[in-house]
């Protein structure tokens, strides 16, 4: 079948990195500079993606594959294939239309991206606040107030933490 198709369509013989040039009797011509074809049998080459401004080049364009971009420092990728770059903020901030703004009291963000989230409400779990929250960190909940009352039995220390993926010996 491949052989038959080749006889019918000379373009099917053109490999990736070339295009079937109608202006030259359907000869396979190499893709011009700054263009590529990632599959065989193409009648045109695609323009390479340009990584400029907010984007920077992660992988150069070749005759057979498109360029790949990531974001210039200070910004991070969004979308499939890093289709957009969005501004980083500091921990304790969130990005708004007006740029990076500090988290409101009672909220925190421990990353350079994303939104400020409310501190955990320890009392919902019957616990008390062990460490106060900040703009950058959530509160740390401790034992319930009843556990800390005089005469109460001592708090059982937590079991030693295990590394993720490791089963107990």
């Amino acid at each position: 079948f491949e052989r038959t198709r080749s006889l019918q369509d000379p373009c099917s013989n053109c490999p990736a990195g070339t295009f079937c040039d109608n202006n030259r009797n359907q000869i396979c011509s190499p893709c011009p500079p700054n263009s590529f074809s990632s599959a065989g049998g193409q009648r045109t080459c695609d323009i390479c993606r340009q990584c400029k401004g907010v984007f920077r080049t992660r992988k150069e364009c070749s005759s057979t594959s498109n360029a790949e971009c990531d974001c210039t420092p200070g910004f991070h990728c969004l979308g499939a294939g890093c289709s957009m770059c969005e501004q980083d903020c500091k921990q304790g901030q969130e990005l708004t239309k007006k740029g990076c703004k500090d988290c409101c009291f009672g909220t925190f963000n421990d990353q350079k991206r994303g939104i400020c989230r409310p501190w955990t409400n320890c009392s919902l779990d019957g616990k008390s606040v062990l460490v106060n929250g900040t703009k950058e960190r959530d509160v740390v909940c401790g034992p319930s107030p009843a556990d800390l009352s005089p005469g109460a039995s001592s708090v059982t220390p937590p079991a030693p933490a295990r590394e993720p993926g490791h089963s107990p010996q």
Epitope: G53, L78, G79, K97
Partner: nanobody, 123 residues
Framework: QVQLVESGGGLVQPGGSLRLSCAAS?????NYWMNWVRQAPGKGLEW???????????YYVDSVEGRFTISRDNAKNSLYLQMDSLRAEDTAVYYC????????????????SGQGTTVTVSS
């Protein structure tokens, strides 16, 4: 092909003014939020200002508020940045950048930007 081309950069003394322009082509300019971002020598990229599709909302990074003015002319497919009271710390390459689909709603990502124009503030 979607294209943004900045112009208007140059050498200016502290306290001076410059007006940057950005010519847009290959897309419906009036449908998009637009931004100016800058990169100072040896530093990361910094967002400077943005403007809504119809020009009704404009926002600025604190360090340029009151000194820089962003504007647009949808009939001319052009974005502008009027820079007054320039300081040495404004020295940077300035880029115009298009806000991606959904900008201001679900994200603040930019999907196209130009080659940049260089602004040098020095005496």
């Amino acid at each position: 092909q979607v294209q943004l081309v900045e112009s208007g950069g140059g050498l200016v003394q502290p306290g001076g003014s410059l007006r940057l322009s950005c010519a847009a082509s290959g897309f419906t300019f009036s449908n998009y939020w637009m931004n100016w971002v800058r990169q100072a020598p040896g530093k990361g990229l910094e967002w400077v200002a943005n403007i809504k599709q119809d020009g009704s909302e404009k926002y600025y990074v604190d360090s340029v508020e009151g000194r820089f003015t962003i504007s647009r002319d949808n009939a001319k497919n052009s974005l502008y940045l009027q820079m007054d009271s320039l300081r040495a710390e404004d020295t940077a390459v300035y880029y115009c950048a298009r806000g991606g689909e959904g900008y201001g709603e679900s994200h603040y990502g930019m999907d196209v930007s130009g080659q940049g124009t260089t602004v040098t503030v020095s005496s």
